[in-house]
């Protein structure tokens, strides 16, 4: 066979699917890979073949389309599963060709198991509300064109293991589930469970979310340097060494990169000759505010690292923030006793 | 199915003390804010009090006639809420209910314990 | 605190015949997020209280369609399409905006 454009094998697109349940699975060729559509690749001639390599197996076969009420179908640019078996996890290709073309891409189908609380080795979306920000809602995911809209599903949702009826502050609306004012514990796994007529049967389509409730965008302030401040003054003899933490509280911003940074003499640490060394560590609360403190180390200082301006920096969507440490050399004590010794001896 | 179930009443003399438990099954407690609802023979409902999750900080509130002599209490380990009444006067004989949530209104409701405080 | 206020205190009603029960709050009950704090809830006798409407117009599961609730602000309405036999009790309006947490005093249905 002429040589066919082989775009491996797309990890990228881990797609994880609950066993006994419908899946369709759109060929990524057209998604990600090539610059046409299907309508497009059929219109010209081009052909649309599935196969597959089961679990633990190197054989590539052909999909077979004629199992009972057509369990695996295929519509368009779509493998459908009416519904998924455990053992039919594995890579699947899709490959476009016809006599002069041909391109093809493996994925990984994991066909995945759940227990009775929808409790699954799923990967889960995470989908953040704001802290009592107004009424926030979160869509049941992923059930486009699995049924007309002429069908009317019925959508129950949980969280964690029970129904959602009306609790505190969460009202389910059909494939809407609304949080009158998100609040800490609100945050979970949330499940919708859809289930629709098809030809004379009834599937269930499960989703499940994780919730996490995060800062309110209301409450947000530019970065806060809490050290270095005016209150410590960092006193060192040379020799000594000298650590200067810089704490700086973040209130949480979506999509906000938070930086922090020292300047030694207006320069970054790493553009200057002094033996520095810088370590980071960050915290979380509970509403994803974060905490970061980067220390400053100098092991032995010297009387003109003493003499430096050390500033730490730090920056988030919100805005810029500065602040001086207080660095200075200590004076050596009076050596009152050599000077009473002296005095004594003179009366 | 939710379910609460109130435990813990009697007949006490006036200045006496009781204490009433409401066990939750059916959902995750944790999460709940969770009432105490009292409804003296004959009258309305008066709330008693609340407590939220402790996620959502623990917070406690009480009706000014119980502030002081009742304590609200939870125990998310067991599924349980508490109501501590000291210092009881005739005027707290009612039946007492423990009730869910709050801002949606109470959604699940105890079949209720009577205290009567009578000397 | 807020006073909740409803009328009329009694209402005997005819089975089949509407119904109509009014709340008033000393306060506007509208949330800053735009819900009414506000719910209804029937005693039936003998019973735990059980809730019917919350946030002023949203029905509880598993309340029958004849029962709805309007209003916003300070003024509230319970309404019941065709009283049934069943819907004899003492019914409330609560508040929920803010602690302490308040009822109305009651409107006992009767079936005349």
């Known amino acids: 066979s002429e040589r066919c454009d082989d775009w491996g094998l797309d990890t990228m697109r881990q797609i994880q699917v609950f066993e006994d349940e419908p899946a369709r699975i759109k060929c990524p060729l057209f998604e990600h890979f090539l610059k046409f559509n299907y309508s497009t690749a059929h219109s010209a001639g081009l052909t649309l073949i599935w196969y597959w390599t089961r679990q633990d197996r190197d054989l590539e076969e052909p999909i077979n389309f004629r199992l009972p009420e057509n369990r695996i179908s295929k519509e368009k640019d779509v493998l459908w599963f009416r519904p998924t078996l455990l053992n039919d996890t594995g890579n699947y290709t899709c490959m476009l060709r016809n006599t002069t073309y041909c391109s093809k891409v493996a994925f990984p189908l994991e066909v995945v198991q759940k227990d009775s609380c929808f409790n699954s080795p799923m990967k889960l979306p995470v989908h953040k509300l704001y802290i009592e920000y107004g009424i926030q809602r979160i869509t049941c995911p992923n059930v486009d064109g699995y049924f007309p809209s002429s069908v009317k599903p019925t959508i129950t949702w949980y969280m964690g293991c029970y129904k959602i009826q009306n609790f505190n502050n969460v009202i389910p609306e059909g494939m809407n589930l609304s949080f009158l004012i998100a609040l800490i514990s609100n945050n979970g796994n949330y499940t919708c469970v859809v289930t629709y007529p098809e030809n004379g049967r009834t599937f269930h389509l499960t989703r499940t979310l994780t919730v996490k409730v995060v800062g309110s965008p209301k409450n947000a302030v530019p970065p806060v340097i809490h050290s270095p401040n005016d209150h410590v003054v960092y006193e060192k003899e040379p020799g000594e060494e000298l650590l200067i933490p810089c704490t700086v509280y973040f209130s949480f911003l979506m999509d906000s990169r938070n930086e922090v940074w020292w300047t030694i003499d207006g320069k970054k640490p790493d553009d200057i000759t002094i033996d520095v060394t810088i370590n980071e560590s960050i915290s979380h609360s509970r509403t994803e505010d974060e905490t970061r403190t980067q220390i400053l180390s100098i092991k032995k200082v010297t009387s003109e690292d003493l003499k430096r301006s050390y500033v730490c920096h730090a920056r988030s969507a919100k805005g810029e923030v500065a602040k001086a440490a207080k660095v200075k050399q200590k004076v050596p004590a009076p050596r009152y006793t050599v000077e009473l010794a002296c005095g004594f001896g003179a009366t | 199915e939710v379910q609460l179930v109130e435990s813990g009443g009697g007949l006490v003399k006036p200045g006496g003390s009781l204490r009433l438990a409401c066990a939750a099954t059916g959902f995750t407690f944790s999460n709940v804010w969770m009432s105490w609802v009292r409804q003296g023979s004959g009258k309305g409902l008066e709330w008693v009090g609340r407590i939220k999750s402790k996620a959502d900080g623990g917070t406690i509130d009480y009706a000014a006639p119980v502030k002081g002599r009742f304590t609200i209490s939870r125990d998310d380990s067991k599924n349980t809420l508490y109501l501590q009444m000291n210092s009881l006067k005739t005027e707290d004989t009612a039946m007492y209910y423990c009730t869910t949530g709050e801002l949606l209104g109470f959604d699940y409701w105890g079949q209720g314990t009577l205290v009567t405080v009578s000397s | 605190d807020i006073v909740m206020t409803q009328s009329p205190l009694s209402l005997p009603v005819t089975p089949g015949e509407p119904a109509s029960i009014s709340c008033r709050s000393g306060q506007s009950l509208l949330h800053s997020n735009g819900f009414n704090c506000l719910a209804w809830y029937l005693q039936k006798p003998g019973q735990s209280p059980q809730l019917l409407i919350y946030?002023?117009?949203n029905r509880a599961s598993g309340v029958p369609d004849r029962f709805s609730g309007s209003g916003s602000g300070t003024d509230f309405t319970l309404k019941i399409s065709r009283v049934e036999a069943e819907d004899v009790g003492v019914y409330y309006c609560?508040?929920?905006?803010?602690?302490?947490?308040?009822f109305g005093q009651g409107t006992r249905l009767e079936i005349k």
């Open positions: 946030l002023g117009s």
């Open positions: 609560m508040q929920t905006l803010q602690t302490p947490i308040t």
